[in-house]
Structures are given as C-alpha cells and as structure tokens.
Interface confidence: low
C-alpha cells in the first residue's frame, strides 16, 4: 500500500491496533523491513507499507483526520471529499475525522444528503456499521452532539465555534463519499440547532448534547422539525433528568405554528404538545447549576408524525365541574405488541397537550380531542368516590349511580365506571336498588348483556366479592354492611345503545350487622340462580349473608342446592344455614360443616336463606350455589 498526503492538506493518517482480539497470531505493519504496530502519516509525506498477515482488518484500524482552520483564512465550504480516496486505503475499519475550528461568531452548518441521519442512544449500533459522531466545542470543552446512523430524518446540524465530525466505515463498506457538506452561517447564539425533516409518517428519537451524561450548564439547544402541513406531530419525553438549579429554570420552549403565545414554555415534567400541524421548533434551556451538587440535565424524546384522524378536528367537552372525587382516565386498552410501525394513538387536552393516556379530574370542564388512527385502541376507566363522613347528614340520602351523559358521548369505549361508596364505620350501611332487577352471573346462567355491575368490598383488609350482576333478573336490591365498590363494566360496544338500562341508586341506611342481604323476587318464567359471595375463593371467615326470597300468593318456590355437601371444614366455630319461613317464623337449621345439604324443598310463602361461615381450614372453603324456581300452586294451602 502507498499513502501520499499532499503538502498543506492538513491531513494526518493513523494506522493503529484496534480492539484486541483473541487471535493467536499477531500482525504487524511492515515498513522498510521494520515490524511496527502503529503508523502515523502527516501532510506532505508518502509512505509505502504492507501487513504481515492476510486479514489486517481483524487487527488494525485507520483514522484519517483533516483539520480545517477557519480562524486564519477562508473556509473550504461545500461538499466534503473523502481524502485520500477509500480505494487507495487498506481495507481496514476506517474513521474519517474532520475537525473544523472557527470563531465564536461564525455559524457552521453540516448538511446531510439523502439518506438523512437517525440519532442512536448509548449501547445502540447502526445496522450497516456506518456511524456519524458529531461533537461541538464550548471554549476548550468538547461537547458530544450525538451519534447517528443513516436512514433517518436529521438533515442539518448547525453549530458555532467549531465542529468535529467522525465518519466510521467498516472495512467491507463500499462507501466512497462523505455524504455531507459544510456551509457557513451567521452566529446561531446557542450550542447547536438540529433540523429534522419528515417527508411522511414516521418517528424520530433525539437526545440532548452529551446524552446520557449531563447537558452543558446554562446552554441552549434547538431542534427544528419540518413537517408537511397535512400531517400532525406529537412530542413525548422518553427519559429526562433535571439538575439542581441555582439560578434560572430548566425548561423546553416551543415555537408552534399558529400559536399566539410563542414561545410556549413547558417544564420537562409537563405533558408535551401534540397534534401540531406543520413545522415547529423545540429548544432545551439549561440553568446555572449548584456548584456543590450540580446534578445533570438530560433529555431523550420522541417526535411522532402521522396523518390527522377525522376525530382530531373534533373537540369534545367533558364537563366534570359539578362532579367531585372523580377521575376519568382514557388509556390504551391492553394489546399484544406489534413489531411494525404503529401510528401513535393520542388523546389531547385543549388539542395541544397529547399523550397516550390522559386523566381528567372533577371540578373542571375539559376540552379533549383525539389523534388516533383507530379509537377502538383506547378505552375509558372512571372512578368516583361517594363518601359520607357524618351519619347524621347522610342517613336516608340517595344517589344515582349513572354514567354521566358527557362520558357516554365520547367516541371511546367505556370499560369500567367504579363508584367507591364509603360510610362511617358501624354507623351506616348501604342499599343498592337497580332500575331493572338484576341477575347474578353464574356458570349455569351467565350474563349476556353488554354490561354488568361488579360489587365488592372496598375495605382494604377484606377480600369480599359479592358477585357480578346484570339487568334482567330477579334481584330487587342488595344491602351491604359497609364500604363497597360498584363497578359498571362494559363488554360490548352495544353498551351505548343499552345505556338506558343502566341505573342503580345507592342509599345510606341505618347500620346492620350482616355482610350482605339480597332481596329476590323471582319471576314465574325462569329459574333464579344464586351463589355465595367470593365464589371460587370461598365466603370469608365468620361472614354472614342472607337472601330474602319473595313467593307470590299463587306460586310455590322450589329451593334447590347443587351439591350434596357444602365441603367446608371448620378450623374454629361452626358454619350453618338457616331457612326460615317469614310468615310463621318456622326455621330449619343445617350445620354446613357436618350435615348434608337439604334436598329440594318447596316454600309456599316468602322465606329467608341465611348462611354464616366459620373460620375454615385453607382449601376447604364455603361455596354454595342454589336455585329458586316458581311454579303455580295447584292446591290452595292457605
């Protein structure tokens, strides 16, 4: 090989050992019969050399550095050449370095021809092995702007006071052009400006200078995004850290087209803007850091550009100003991750602050819009607390558990609407009265409606799930001893059409000791299936529940249990069931941990079924399923 560097070219070539490998046989550069492991060639020198092995690319790397001095004379602007030409160089992993020094008042612009660049983070590598490492200078300090691969959106990087560009090419890569040019610009009065151009839909991940280390103190860095007017851009911060500021505040500023409040200033912890049409700028501003404990400022963010959806121009008003203790969350429904590019699905507050999920709280009116290709990718979950702290104020008061119409009008499916109903301990209890009688969901008779009410205890230490209930059954009311959560869960988009069937009223009533009482008024047409709370896990220890079952005068009720034995084994106490005729008060008592369950029995008058649990041994829980069927009386037994 022969390398000749012209005089005044300001080029230095360095061939040196690369990262050591476990190859047994060493390799040397052979020059004038000398064996060396490093060779430096300066401007004006001509050197002939060879290698002592057949695969020098496994041992050596070559660095070609060109110093460009714009301080003392005119700058060689324009397209940057690869000198010496790659065809004249040995086939080693090679790094071309251009080190441009300029006055602070001079702006330097690196322009990248297509394919543009894509920034990568620490630990990432480029698929083709071609990387661009770009750094700038603040006085004597080198600042890493970033490492970039091909096939991205970054088209230009502007800096001042100098720039160092390193192009790394693997030994096998055929590239023979630098792919960029240098131009001079007026002072940019900041560390750097990165221009990112989107031709169509796509995303770009970008990072602050020196990432993942700290952004230089009190510096300013700007990203300019060129976005076709028919597309929309959204910014989301993937990772950031704030330093300890002594003066000023770390922030990001946006220049957004059409905004009357430019620049729009955001804290890094704020939700960032979305649904922006056309070009915009984003700037990161550092602060004066505490000398003793500076901390670090760093930022990694993503810009997502996509087509606006029909919904993105619609504004929905969610009026929660008259609500309290309520939060509404719009979020992605769980899905399997797809590997291909999926357009973002965002919900936007005031059409500007967009994110993949959004929580609205009571006490205000909210204006929201959507930036999403498919709104079925989102759903809504709502929580509302109705609490009574003073039994004297709340006793006998009633509240309607209805999904507000503002929420039903949103174009996103409601998943859960949970009411947390809180009462003063041992002072008040609750009664739930449905607009339409409820059916308890069982394996034998599952609910097939578009929604159900899930009723569970809301006392943290108590694991008690009363069951899932849907309209169209025989349960007239449910009384519960203390705090519960009632969740309206939807199962089908048809809930919108069936919403009129929802309707549950809760009333605060005088305290009673039983965990739950179900009032059942069976219809003559169907069999009513009822089961104990906490099905599959067993009725909690020492818990008592009752069913008040009405039997019309002209009917007889058949009570049937679906097991021969309850299966419960008591560790302490007794588990028992009482079946009591309401008219005569006559009762039968069954020991559930000893006796067999009663055979089907016929009841001519309304009756109670009361089940009380012991403290069962683990694995031997109390689960009972029974049914009530009405048939016409053939003989009047009164």
């Amino acid at each position: 090989f022969e390398i000749a560097l012209p005089r005044e070219s300001n080029i230095t070539v360095l061939i040196k050992l690369g990262t050591p490998t476990l190859l047994a046989k060493p390799c040397y550069i052979v020059i004038s019969k000398r064996h060396i492991t490093m060779l430096s060639i300066k401007s004006g020198e001509r050197i002939v050399f060879t290698f002592s092995c057949q695969s020098p690319e496994n041992h050596f790397v070559i660095e070609i550095q060109k110093n460009i001095d714009c301080m003392s004379g005119p700058c060689p602007f324009g397209e940057v050449q690869l000198q010496p030409s790659t065809s004249l160089l040995p086939t080693l992993n090679r790094t071309f370095i251009w080190d441009v020094k300029a006055h602070k008042s001079i702006g330097l612009e690196l322009q990248f021809s297509i394919p543009r660049l894509r920034q990568i983070g620490p630990g990432e590598s480029c698929p083709d092995g071609v990387t661009h490492s770009i750094s700038g200078r603040i006085d004597a300090t080198v600042v890493r702007i970033g490492t970039f691969c091909s096939n991205g959106t970054v088209s230009r990087i502007k800096m001042q006071e100098g720039v160092k560009m390193a192009l790394h090419l693997p030994w096998f890569h055929p590239r023979n052009v630098s792919g960029f040019s240098i131009a001079n610009r007026s002072s940019i009065k900041r560390l750097c400006i990165i221009e990112s151009v989107f031709e169509g839909e796509g995303s770009a991940t970008l990072m602050s200078a020196n990432y993942p280390e700290g952004f230089p103190e009190d510096e300013l860095m700007t990203w300019q995004f060129v976005v076709p007017a028919h597309l929309r851009a959204s910014v989301s911060f993937l990772n950031f850290n704030l330093s300890n500021c002594e003066r000023k505040e770390e922030r990001v500023e946006y220049y957004i087209p059409g905004s009357t409040t430019n620049p729009e200033v955001f804290k890094l912890e704020d939700k960032q803007p979305g649904n922006m049409a056309g070009n915009f700028n984003l700037s990161l501003q550092g602060c004066d850091q505490d000398a003793q404990s500076p901390g670090i400022l760093r930022l990694q963010f993503q810009v997502l550009v996509q087509h606006p959806q029909n919904e993105s121009n619609k504004i929905y008003v969610v009026d929660l100003s008259n609500e309290r203790a309520m939060s509404l969350t719009i979020e992605p429904r769980p899905v399997k991750q797809s590997r291909k590019f999926v357009p973002g699905c965002f919900v936007c507050l005031e059409s500007r602050t967009c994110s993949s999920n959004l929580t609205l709280t009571s006490g205000s009116k909210h204006k929201i819009s959507f930036l999403c290709d498919d709104l079925t990718r989102l759903w809504m979950n709502v929580e509302k607390t109705i609490s009574c702290t003073d039994h004297r104020y709340c006793q006998r008061k009633s509240y309607s558990l209805q999904v507000p119409s503002d929420i039903l009008h949103l174009p996103v499916e409601l998943h859960d609407f949970s009411w947390k109903l809180l009462v003063p301990k041992d002072r008040l209890s609750l009664v739930l009265v449905p607009a339409q009688k409820l059916q308890q969901h069982t394996h034998e008779k599952p609910c097939n409606t578009s929604f159900s009410y899930l009723v569970a205890s809301a006392i943290p230490s108590q694991d008690l799930y009363f069951g899932s209930f849907c309209p169209g059954g025989s349960i007239k009311q449910i009384q519960v001893k203390q705090n519960i959560s009632v969740t309206l869960r939807t199962f089908a988009p048809s809930f919108q059409q069936e919403a009129s069937r929802q309707g549950l009223t809760v009333s605060f009533i005088p305290y009673f000791k039983e965990e739950g009482v179900f009032t059942v008024t069976p219809d003559t047409k169907s069999k009513v299936y009822l089961r104990t709370p906490n099905w599959d896990r067993g009725l909690p220890s020492l818990t008592s529940v009752s069913w008040n079952i009405s039997v019309p005068r002209d009917q007889v009720a058949c009570l049937t249990f679906f097991k021969e034995r309850s299966g419960v084994v008591c560790q302490t106490g007794r588990a028992f069931m009482i079946i009591q005729e309401q008219r005569t008060r006559a009762e039968e008592i069954f020991s559930l941990d000893e006796d067999v369950l009663p055979k089907p029995s016929f009841h001519h008058h309304s009756f109670w079924v009361n089940i009380s649990n012991c403290s069962p041994t683990s694995g031997k829980q109390l689960d009972l399923l029974f049914s009530v069927t009405l048939t016409p009386r053939t003989v009047d037994l009164t």
Epitope: R324, A325, S387, T389, K397
Partner: antibody, heavy 119, light 107 residues
Amino acid sequence: QVQLQQSGSELKKPGESVKLSCKASGYTLTDFSMHWVRQAPGQGLKWMGWINTETGAPTYADDFKGRFVFSLDTSVSMAYLQISSLKSEDTAVYYCSRGRDYDPHFDYWGQGTLVTVSS
Amino acid sequence: EIVLTQSPATLSLSPGERATLSCRASQSISDFLHWYQQKPGQAPRLLIKYASQSISGIPARFSGSGPGSDFTLTISSVEPEDFAVYYCQSAHSFPYTFGQGTKLEIK
C-alpha cells in the same frame, strides 16, 4: 338564576323573639340542604346547623340548641330561623346558605339579615 | 370538633404580588375543606371546593392545595378586587367549622 333572598334587618329587645326568612329561587328547595351561619360584628363565621329540606329534620350545632329553631315551608320555597329569648350576644348577621353534596360546601348565600338586640 | 387555624391573621401585599394563605386542621380531614372570600358588607363567596377544585366563574388566579391537614389558598397575582377576608371551612363532620379568617390588605 339561583338566589337566596333574606328578610330585612331587625331591632329587638332582650327576651323577645324574631323569625328570619330565606326565600329560595332559581332551583328546587328540596334538592339541596339549607344551612344557617352566624357572624357577630367584627367576628368570623360560625355554622349554626342545617335543615334537611326533604324531610324537614333540623340538626343544630351544640351552641345553638334550645333557643334556635329551623323550619321550612316548601310550598313557597321558604326556610326560616326563629330565635327566642333574645340576648345581646345574639346581635349578628345571620346568613342562610345552600349546601351542595353529601359533604356540603355553600355555593349560594343569602345577603344576610342583621339582628340587633339592645335594650 | 375540627379546629381550623388560619395564618397569617393579616397579610399585607401590593397588587401583582403572590398571596399564600394557610389553613391547618386539628386532624386529617382528607379534602373536605372549602375556601370563601368575604368583602365588607357582603355575604361570603365560595372560591375553592374540596381543597383544590376550582369553581365556575372564579378567576384562575385562585388555586388551592390539599388534602390532609395542611391546606393552602394561593392567589398567583393579587388584583385590587382581591383585598378581602378569606375563610376556610371544614365539611368533614359535624359541627362544620370555619377558620378565624385571614385579612388580605393593601400594602
């Protein structure tokens, strides 16, 4: 719009009685509770109690049990506060206010009635 | 009963300054706390409900924080019409109580 219109100022002698009225308009009286608040001259606000406008059941704070009576006439959307055996320390502005929700905040107030008790 | 202690008793500020009014409850009352403004010769006016919820028609410069036992009413930039007495009120349990008030006066 919602309004609570209170009766005019009263000048009374110790030992006499007075009945203050509060007329609710712009909403249905029975949908919200009615509370009474007292403010002595140059002093802060003191909650006297409330009346359940659905049932007519009153609740009094401890300092206002005995001589103070809350009542209603729902047919004319009126709430009343009667104070008997007036004392000089009853001199104050009395406000009626509408209670919202199950843990009330007072979103609308009457303009207040000044009761002066002086011999 | 819940005792509410407001501080300072008097706050002297110039228009444009930020006002921070404190209300401390004798025990935790969650967010069952409301703020009222009262001008001389007028009835109180509800400013903030449930510690931090804004009220329709009340300027956005009024904000509140909570829950717990320490509550704050903040006026981001005091306007001339904001000089008045401010009361906090507990709605946690009977009897409902008011703080003794903070007078915001012109400096």
